[in-house]
Structures are given as C-alpha cells and as structure tokens.
C-alpha cells in the first residue's frame, strides 16, 4: 500500500485540477491538512481536500452520472422518438389517402351525392385521425354517424330524386330509419368491426411508443440521491485528496457502486423486457383486419357496396320509409342507371412498379428488431456506464474507494466501506417515486398490449369468412384486397409502397371541382425511408 503524501508536500497538483472544476483556489489547502471535518473522503493521514471541496466533488459526481446516463440512452431515445413521429405521420397519410379514395368513389359513381358526401366523409376521417391520437371517440358512433348522415342524402338524391327540397325536413326520421330498416344491410356492422379492431391496435401501438419515450425521459432525468453522490465521489474523486491524480477506479468496484446507485432504475428491467416482447406480439398480429392501412384503404369499396345494397332494395325501402316517416309518396321508385361495378378513375390508382418495397408493416418489424437489441438496456446500464467512464483494466493497480490496490477484492472493499456507507441500505430503499410511477405505466401498457384481441399466428385467416369480414379470397398470401365486387377489385401488394409511389395524390379537399390531379408529396414519400441503421451498444 503506497504511503500517504508526506506532510511537507504541497497540494499543487490537486489545486490545479480543482481549479478546473471551481475557479478560485480559496477552498484548496496549500499543504496537506488533517481533514477531520471530511465526511466522504475519510483520510488515513493528511489530505489535500477540504469540506467545501468534497461538496463540490459530490455535485460534480452527480452531474457526471446524469450525463453518462443520458448519453447511454441517447440512441434508444432517438430510435423511439423518430419512429413514433414517422408512424404518426404515416398513419395520417393513410387516413388522408383513404378519405381521398372514398371521395373519388363518390365523385365517380354518385356525383349527385358529392357535396354532402364529401362533408360526411371528411368528418368521419377526421374522427378516425383523432381516435388514433387518443381522443375519446367511440368507433361505432363514428360509423353510425357516417351512415346516418349519408342515408337521407341517398334517399332524397338517389332513391327519390323528385322529392321537394322540403323533404329534408324529415332528415331526422330518415337517419333513424337507416337503422330501423337496416337499409345498408350488414355493411355498417362489418365496417365497425374492421375499423374498430384496426384503429384500436394502431392507437395502442402509438400509445406504447409514446410511453417508451416517457420511460427513457424519466430515467434520463433521474436525480441521484446524496448517498449515491457520496459513493460516486469516493470512487471518482477521493483519490485526488491523496494526490493520486492518474489512478482509475477498479472495474469491479465501479460495478458495485453503479449497481447501488442504479438499484431503483434496474427495477424497470423486468417491465421493459415485457414491454418490448408485448409490443413485438402486437406488431406480429397487425395484418388483415388488424392493419389500419389494409382496412382504411379498402373502405371506399365497402361503402360503395353498401350503397349498391340500398339501391337493390330501393323499391321496398321507399314504401316502408313512406310509412315510418309519413311523407306522401308522389312517385314510384325509378332507378336511374348506376354501374354495378365500382368505377375508380385509373389516374387515382396508378401504381408505379419499383424494385424497392417498403411497407408500414415491414417498417414496424424493423423497429421491433432494433428495439429488441435494447431489451437488456436497464439491466446492462451499470456495466455500460462503468465501461464508458475511466476504470482500470483487469482490476489491477486501481482505486477501491479508500486506497490504491494491487488487485481489487469486492469483499475487502465492502468491509472497508461498511462503516462509511451501507450499499445494502441503498438498495433496500426501493426506487424513486418517479421510477415507481413509470413502472406502473409500463405495467398498464403491458396489460393493454397483452389483452388486445389479436390473432395468434395466422389463425385469423380461417375465421375471416365465419365472421363475415372478407368475402372471397384475394389470391396470394401476401396480397391484400382493397376491392369490392367483380372487375372493380383492386389488388394491392404492400400498401405503403403503393401509397408512397402513388402517381397521383388525389386530394378532393384541395380542388373539389377539378380533375383531381396532383403530384405525390415528396415529404410524404421520404417519411417512410431510411431511419439509418442504428446499432445498439447494449446487446
């Protein structure tokens, strides 16, 4: 064991180092002093530290620790923040395209309905966006409102075009008649099921990502306790009091200290692991009716089918509504020609053929793979921080908190620390209140993720027809339908590529009376590409 510096030695080196921490030298003794007032760097002989210096070291140690923690989580934080933003934007783009397809369907097939239909469709998709972002809207109510609003217009414009304008007075009765007579058949129920399942999953996916950010932010900004500050000071700075400026802490000692300081944070580990695995399970189930992209982009077709259903039953319906809403029937129902098959302007759905294919679903899977590389993030934190702060290689000739040692022995170090500081006590205190809160939030989201009514594997496919979700098979396994009947069916392979490379972004909102031609928005396309290949240090 090297002897303490001789009493006549100056504290010159310590002074110059401390000067960098705290300009002004009034706290540093000229020569070593007994240091009887020290509480952390308890001297075995004369020391170059004062009580004020010790306090400054503690403050610096805690700040260092916070910075180390922030740099440790920077990559993970960036990964989740960026993906949360990308997916939110992607979902909004899907909603906008779905709205535009639906408006295009009305414009091309039912021009007499367009002004009002655009309004109702717009309100519906606004509600869809709000729901995804967490608004307290009921999906069934949204769908009911859409069909309740559409029916009076269909009735007065399509089924009874000769009715006087005053017939709009019976709107309220027609809205109700829509449900009483089930005028759209089972289509509203079908849409409710598909939209609610897909949006619920989408919403919880975004919720989970945002909670991930909150977890990282919480642990990122943890304030370390005074006890931890003392331990860190003893590890990083007490050697300076003995003039040992170049000595590094022992690696094993660093691990012990970090585990003590991070005992509360490490408790998140179990719930963090479960969070990533539950999120993976959710993502694996996001296809077919659980994939909002697939469902929303096919809505225009289902709505078209529902209007055709009304038209096929128009004669009978007009008679019954005459009774229910008591308007005088001046004319027999006469159906104008309406095409059987869905007509969609080919300009709208021109798909570019490209080599590179990236979809929302592949993007989700990619995110999960990256997140899985951070599955041990919290349990690995103490080791990570030690490996990113100066420690002695191989635990030889290193500082153990009290003295320079040839080889670090955990037992000896613990014994030596017993009277100064109880590590066990620190662990027993339990996590900080903020950590407890974030653990509760993780438990909650994990439960939500687990209880989502998601299909297990590909079992869902067998049940589709029983539940009436999809009629007819769309061929290849990886293809999804967004089409209705006959030749009007459009097959879409990998929807997001299809979205990103739409040759025309039909935005009916922007130009209700024009030919609806618009070029794709470059920023929308780029949104879905290149997050960069982030590699995790905490594998």
């Amino acid at each position: 064991q090297p002897p303490p510096p001789p009493p006549d030695a100056t504290c010159h080196q310590v002074r110059s180092f401390f000067q960098r921490l705290q300009p002004g030298l009034k706290w540093v003794p000229e020569t070593p002093v007994p240091g009887s007032d020290l509480q952390v760097c308890l001297p075995k002989g004369p020391t170059c530290c004062s009580r004020k210096m010790e306090e400054k070291y503690q403050l610096t140690a805690r700040l260092n620790m916070e910075q180390l923690l922030q740099s440790a989580s920077m990559e993970l934080k960036f990964l989740i923040i960026q993906n949360a933003a990308v997916f939110q934007e992607a979902f909004e783009i899907v909603v906008r395209h779905a709205k535009n397809y639906t408006n295009a369907m009305f414009k091309n097939n039912y021009p007499s309905l367009t002004p009002q239909a655009f309004e109702f469709v717009g309100e519906f998709f606004t509600d869809v966006s709000l729901y995804i972002l967490g608004s307290d809207i009921n999906v069934d109510d949204m769908v009911n409102e859409l069909f309740d609003s559409l029916f009076p217009v269909i009735y007065t414009q399509l089924m009874n075009p000769g009715l006087p304008d005053s017939a709009l007075d019976i709107n309220e009765c027609l809205r109700g008649a829509r449900r009483d007579l089930k005028v759209f058949g089972n289509f509203p129920k079908l849409i409710m099921t598909q939209v609610s399942k897909s949006l619920q999953v989408t919403r919880i996916f975004l919720q989970a990502l945002n909670l991930g950010i909150e977890v990282i932010n919480t642990t990122d900004h943890l304030k370390f306790s005074k006890d931890c500050g003392r331990m860190l000071t003893r590890m990083w700075y007490c050697s300076y009091c003995q003039g040992l400026m170049m000595v590094k802490p022992c690696g094993g000692y660093c691990n012990v200290v970090m585990q003590g300081c991070m005992a509360g944070v490490v408790e998140i580990d179990k719930y963090w692991r479960e969070y990533i695995l539950s999120l993976e399970e959710l993502v694996n189930g996001m296809y077919r009716i659980y994939d909002m992209e697939n469902v929303l982009l096919g809505l225009f077709s289902t709505i078209h089918d529902s209007i055709q259903y009304v038209q096929k039953n128009a004669g009978k319906l007009t008679t019954t509504i005459g009774k229910l809403c008591a308007h005088s029937q001046q004319r027999q129902y006469r159906s104008a020609y309406y095409p059987e098959d869905l007509f969609i302007d080919k300009k709208v759905l021109k798909v570019a053929h490209v080599e590179h294919e990236e979809t929302l679903s592949s993007r989700r899977r990619e995110l999960i793979q990256k997140l899985k590389s951070f599955i041990s993030f919290y349990s690995a934190l103490p080791g990570y921080i030690c490996s990113h702060s100066p420690v002695a290689e191989n635990d030889t000739l290193c500082w153990n908190g009290q003295e320079l040692v040839e080889r670090y022995s955990q037992k000896a170090a613990r014994n030596g620390m017993k009277n100064q500081f109880n590590l066990h006590e620190l662990k027993m205190k339990g996590p900080e209140p903020v950590v407890s809160q974030i653990i509760d939030k993780l438990k909650h989201i994990n439960q939500l993720l687990r209880t989502m009514s998601m299909p297990k594997g590909r079992v869902l496919d067998k049940n589709l027809d029983e539940e009436g979700f999809e009629s007819g098979d769309c061929g290849d396994d990886e293809d999804e339908c967004i089409g209705g009947s006959g030749d009007g069916m459009i097959k879409v392979k990998n929807q997001l590529r299809f979205l990103a490379e739409l040759a025309y972004d039909l935005d009916v909102d922007d130009a209700p009376g024009n030919s609806q031609q618009a070029t794709p928005k470059d920023n929308e396309i780029s949104t879905f590409h290149n997050l960069g290949n982030v590699h995790s240090p905490l594998k």
Partner: antibody
Framework: QVQLVQSGAEVKKPGASVKVSCKAS????????ISWVRQTPGQGLEWMGW????????NYAQKLQGRVTMTTDTSTSTAYMELSSLRSEDTAVYYC??????????WGQGTLVTVSS | QPVLTQPPSVSVAPGKTARITCGGN??????VHWYQQKPGQAPVLVIY???DRPSGIPERFSGSNSGNTATLTISRVEAGDEADYYC???????????FGTGTKVTVL
C-alpha cells in the same frame, strides 16, 4: 332545449270528447312527428298513434281507429289529440312525445283525463 | 302485432347490476328502445337503437339485442334508478309502435 308542454287536466262525462294540446319548442317542429301515448292508472304504456308535422299524415292504433283524431298547427308548433265517445276505461294520463324514427325521444309532462259520470 | 314480455319486477342491491329482459319473437331483427319512468313523471328515453345512450344518460345504462331477447343492463345500481322500465319496438308489418309490459326495478 326541447320542450313539449301539454294542456291541463280534464274531467269528462262518458260519451263526450276531449281535446288535449301539446306545444313544442326548442326544435324545428316540422322535422319530427308527434306521437300520443296513454297510461291508465297503475298500468303500462299504450301507443295511440302519430302525426307527421311535416305533412299532416297520420297513423292510428287499430283499437282507437274512428274515435281518435290527431292534428297539428305548424304556425304555433302545436299538436292536438282529440278522443271522442269517451268511456270510463279512457281514464288515463295522455302523453305527447316527439317521434324520431321509431323512438320517442322527448315527452310532454302528461295530461290526466278522467272520464266519470 | 308483436307481444313484448318483460318480468314484472326486478330487485337489486345498490352497487350491483340489474338486468331487465324484453322477450319477443325474433326481436333481434328489430330496433329496441328503452324508457325509464319514475312515479308521477313522464317516461324518459334511456337507450335507443338497442344500445345507444342519449346525452345525459349515465354510462351505467347499456343495452343489447339478439335472437328473441333484448336486455337493458344497469350497472352499479343507485337508489335513483328505482323506476318502471319499458321496452318498445316499431312493428313494420302492422306499422304500429309496441311497448313492453313494463318492469318495476326496486333498489333494496
């Protein structure tokens, strides 16, 4: 807010007629129908019929056909129900109710009609 | 004209759940509405179109309808829920509006 205010209680002799009024406010009168429902003491609800405020079309319950007449005055947003040839079993509280499609979403406070010799 | 059958009475302890049924042939194919009537007052619509709640009606009230039975469910029952409850449908074949026999809910 939507309100339906009915006329006051009536006491009638058997064979006489009674006319109950129902004044609507707080909504577009012609956009809804007005239905009439009665409730005999200690008994359930019985639908009597309805009238479209939009065009005056009526639909009466079979058992009251010929004895009941429903009318509206759109200028005052008022509906009327007249029941003739009263008998003791017509003693009841008579309600007017705003008719949506097949549901009655707002009700008047009720009018007690007592038929007694 | 359909007959809608309801149990004459249902008793329930406060905080518990009350279920009132309305039976009718293939009632699931019709829209069912429910009314609450407190003594000396006019009926109030509490559920329409099987399961929708008008504004102002607490979430504790819910409805369902399938097969031959429609059900009104009152969860976390309160003393103020004590009333008569009626179901109602529109019969398209006779073009008549039919009320159920009524159920008296007593809160113990």
């Amino acid at each position: 807010q939507v309100q339906l205010v009915q006329s006051g209680a009536e006491v009638k002799k058997p064979g006489a007629s009674v006319k109950v009024s129902c004044k609507a406010s707080g909504y577009t009168f012609t956009s809804y129908g007005i239905s009439w429902v009665r409730q005999t003491p200690g008994q359930g609800l019985e639908w009597m019929g309805w009238i479209s405020a939009y065009n005056g079309n009526t639909n009466y319950a079979q058992k009251l056909q010929g004895r009941v007449t429903m009318t509206t005055d759109t200028s005052t947003s008022t509906a009327y129900m007249e029941l003739s040839s009263l008998r003791s079993e017509d003693t009841a509280v008579y309600y007017c109710a705003r008719k949506g499609s097949s549901q009655f979403d707002q009700w008047g406070q009720g009018t007690l009609v007592t038929v007694s010799s | 004209q359909p007959v809608l059958t309801q149990p004459p009475s249902v008793s329930v302890a406060p905080g518990k759940t009350a279920r009132i049924t309305c039976g009718g042939n293939n009632i699931g194919s019709k829209s069912v509405h429910w009314y609450q009537q407190k003594p000396g007052q006019a009926p109030v619509l509490v559920i329409y179109y099987d399961s929708d709640r008008p504004s102002g009606i607490p979430e504790r009230f819910s409805g369902s309808n399938s097969g031959n039975t429609a059900t009104l469910t009152i969860s976390r029952v309160e003393a103020g829920d004590e009333a008569d409850y009626y179901c109602q449908v529109w019969d398209s074949s006779s073009d008549h509006y039919v009320f159920g026999t009524g159920t008296k809910v007593t809160v113990l």
